[in-house]
């Protein structure tokens, strides 16, 4: 028997520095978690103690904090090289700055293989990107070899900016021939490492013959055996065992997100490469694990540029950006309109000739808008200004919801109107009319939404049974501010880009902004 230790991360999302327990900015260092300096300490400790160790990342290192905004992926290559990762799978967010934004800072600089078997380059890109990422890699580990085969969500064209010269194939269809190839090369221990979400991870374990272990990402799934050590609630045991169609027990793992945990899986193989046993748990990277001093010093050195960036002008506003709670929790506010317009703009993807865009709607809880921006400061808008407006370090995500769920959400928006509560929704691509004389649950008298399958966008009445794509804060997707119906009824949820980054990019692109209050939200008075 031969034992392999798989250490794994996924969906780190630019959390190079330690964070608070909820993965936002670290405030009280004695209670902070994660970060590459602490991760390095734990990885080195395990490497010293155990003979056959692989450190793997399942994608989405990109996007999530000012680190990515400023360094654009160079920080990922630098610190992953420093930690001596053995392999990484491409996630959807690795394409956020286009293919160039992946090739130059990461693919060309990484000293470890970057993998995806289901992404195929075509046209002029094929030769440019050739060899920079691979479908699989055979890694020597001790006296043995292990095959790592990569995969990436086929939804990436809807979630990021991979351009028109990359084709995202079905994961299972693409993986099988690559695994078969590894088998012909006498590689009998194969790990599928990828970024398509827990449901696809389980399908890969079930359907792809020859895959021994699946290490996944994208869905931020937390698995744990026993009493979990922090706030995350396990979606199942670690590892999650799937019985494959050919009768094998295949362990599937994921390690939540944001570098808070280091996945730790021990696999025992027999001499024919069959998994005999698998066990482990994610390791919580809390303050009991010291930060490595040399990595920490390097982080501090890179940090300097971030502080300078946050006071630089991104663009100008020539109007007052009303982000006051007196406005945004009671009526349409132009800060809400600005943010929603930025959210839609960030999700422009012309992937189908029938659609001008795949998504037209945005909702945003008014309580998430925490500050106005005064235009009388020469109109200057900085990252620092935006951090006061959006201080929670959330993401703007893509969900699919039925019209009936959206209707419930808008009813919830005004169910206790007048109490300055945060659930009042700001919108984009939506025209809503409320009648507050009606009873809670029956106050939405008109709800029109902007068409997507049209060449000239126009507003049509919401259809209860139709499925709509909506951009919203992850806070709402997770049921925050009482939007339980969104959490319970969403049909799909893909995490998006950092909220401040979305708005800052939009402002930089527009250069001068002047958002108005334009009748997206109206109130009518019936006879109730």
């Amino acid at each position: 028997a031969w034992e392999l230790t798989i250490l794994h991360t996924n969906d780190v999302h630019s959390r190079l520095e330690q964070t608070s327990e909820d993965s936002s900015k670290c405030v009280n260092a004695s209670r902070c978690m994660g970060g590459v300096a602490r991760l390095f300490t734990k990885v080195q400790q395990i490497r010293r103690a155990e003979p056959n160790v692989l450190l793997l990342d399942a994608g989405d290192q990109y996007q999530g904090t000012i680190w990515f905004t400023v360094y654009k992926g160079a920080e990922v290559a630098h610190f992953m090289n420093a930690l001596r990762y053995d392999a990484m799978a491409l996630g959807n967010h690795e394409f956020d700055n286009g293919v160039e934004g992946l090739i130059e800072p990461l693919l060309k600089e990484a000293k470890f293989p970057i993998l995806s078997a289901n992404i195929k380059a075509k046209g002029p890109l094929a030769s440019q990107i050739s060899g920079l990422y691979l479908p699989y890699k055979v890694l020597p580990v001790g006296d043995e070899v292990v095959g790592i085969v990569g995969y990436t969500s086929k939804e990436t064209p809807f979630l990021s900016n991979p351009g028109t010269n990359l084709v995202f194939e079905d994961e299972i269809t693409a993986l099988q021939p690559e695994v078969d190839k590894l088998k012909t090369l006498n590689v009998n221990k194969i790990i599928a490492l990828g970024h398509s979400g827990f449901e696809m991870d389980k399908l890969i374990a079930q359907k792809v013959r020859g895959v021994d272990v699946v290490v996944g990402g994208h869905s931020n799934t937390f698995l744990y055996t026993g009493n979990p050590p922090s706030k995350e609630v396990p979606a199942g045991k670690y590892p999650f065992i799937v019985t494959s169609d050919d009768g094998r027990k295949v362990p599937v793992v994921q390690a939540y997100a944001f570098g808070k945990y280091l996945g730790y899986l021990k696999i025992e193989f027999d001499e024919r490469g069959n998994v005999i046993s698998s066990h482990g748990n994610p390791i919580l990277l809390n303050s009991s694990i010291p930060e490595d001093p040399s990595i920490k010093a390097d982080i501090n050195k890179w940090r300097i540029k971030l502080d300078n960036y946050s006071t630089q002008e991104l663009g100008k506003t020539i109007v007052y950006l009303d982000g006051s709670s007196q406005s945004c929790r009671f009526r349409e506010c132009n800060m809400g309109n600005l943010i929603c317009d930025a959210m839609i703009n960030n999700n422009l993807r012309h992937t189908d000739e029938m659609f001008w865009n795949h998504v037209s709607m945005c909702i945003l809880n008014g309580g998430g808008i925490r500050s106005p921006i005064d235009e009388r400061n020469n109109g200057t808008i900085t990252w620092e200004n935006l951090a006061a407006v959006l201080p929670f370090g959330g993401t703007f995500d893509l969900v699919q919801l039925k019209g009936s769920t959206l209707k419930k959400a808008f009813e919830h928006s005004v169910h206790r109107y007048g109490q300055s509560t945060g659930e009042f929704l700001q919108v984009g691509g939506i025209h809503v009319v409320y009648d507050l004389s009606r009873k809670p649950g029956d106050r939405v008298v008109k709800l029109d939404v902007l068409c997507t399958k049209c060449r000239v966008p126009s507003y049509d009445p919401l259809k209860m049974d139709e499925v709509y794509k909506v951009i919203l804060p992850n806070f709402l997707a997770n049921g925050g501010d009482g939007f339980q119906m969104i959490k319970d009824e969403l049909l799909r949820h893909d995490s998006g880009d950092q909220d401040i980054n979305v708005v800052s990019t939009y402002i930089s692109k527009m250069k001068v902004i002047y958002p108005a209050v334009e009748g997206r939200i109206k109130f009518s008075t019936g006879s109730h």
């Epitope: 419930k408 919830h412 169910h415 206790r416 004389s437 009873k439 809670p440 006879s527």
Partner: antibody, heavy 123, light 107 residues
Framework: QVQLQQWGAGLLKPSETLSLTCAVY????????WSWIRQPPGKGLEWIGE???????NYNPSLKSRVTISVDTSKNQFSLKLSSVTAADTAVYYC?????????????????WGQGTTVTVSS | DIQMTQSPSSLSASVGDRVTITCRAS??????LNWYQQKPGKAPKLLIY???SLQSGVPSRFSGSGSGTDFTLTISSLQPEDFATYYC?????????FGGGTKVEIK
């Protein structure tokens, strides 16, 4: 003093349509929701649906495919139709007024009720 | 739909007793909770709205409390006319749903 008076057929065969009407006496019809609630023998209360003076309706999803509530504002009446009845629809059916309560009108409650109509479905 | 769970389903008490009935919602309903009293062969009567506000004409011995998911109806000193079945009802979100009822009987 607002009063609700209700009437309709009390004995039905399976697959027939239940039809009940409720008249509002001594009060305004607008500004309220007019509801139907039922109570099977020895059991609890189940909300069927409601209508306002403009004809806007809300139905219980569990009954929606079979229920129609309508209003005749000229007569200050509202009606319930429940199609394709079975023995499971045997119950006392109540009409009720649901009005805004308190100063802020967040809270609505059924503050006036009809006397109830016993409906039996039997072959 | 939101499930409303009432407990106990029945209780025996004497005149003058303090009686407490609880109602739990399957998810938060803020303060959108009403309490009704029903006597045999009669229509229900609204006692409490908005979890704690007494409907006009209802004796002050009836009181309600709670918010979110847990609610209580209290009768401070049970009177002979209070022997009946009591129902809680959540008002929002639609559809309104009732608890299973609590029957208060004479000991």
């Amino acid at each position: 003093q607002v009063q609700l008076q209700q009437w309709g057929a009390g004995l039905l065969k399976p697959s027939e349509t239940l039809s009940l009407t409720c008249a509002v006496y001594g009060g305004s019809f607008s500004g309220y929701y007019w509801s139907w609630i039922r109570q099977p023998p020895g059991k609890g209360l189940e909300w069927i649906g409601e209508i306002d003076h403009s004809g806007s309706t809300n139905y219980n999803p569990s009954l929606k495919s079979r229920v129609t509530i309508s209003v005749d504002t000229s007569k200050n009446q509202f009606s319930l139709k429940l199609s394709s009845v079975t023995a499971a629809d045997t119950a006392v059916y109540y009409c009720a007024r649901e009005g805004g309560l308190g100063e802020d009108y967040y809270y609505y409650g059924m503050d006036v009720w009809g006397q109830g109509t016993t409906v039996t479905v039997s072959s | 739909d939101i499930q409303m769970t009432q407990s106990p389903s029945s209780l025996s008490a004497s005149v003058g007793d303090r009686v407490t009935i609880t109602c739990r919602a399957s998810q938060s309903i803020s303060s959108y909770l009403n309490w009704y009293q029903q006597k045999p062969g009669k229509a229900p009567k609204l006692l409490i709205y908005g979890a704690s506000s007494l409907q006009s004409g209802v004796p002050s011995r009836f009181s309600g409390s709670g918010s979110g998911t847990d609610f209580t109806l209290t009768i401070s000193s049970l009177q002979p006319e209070d022997f009946a079945t009591y129902y809680c009802q959540q008002q929002y979100p639609l559809p309104p749903t009732f608890g299973g009822g609590t029957k208060v009987e004479i000991k």
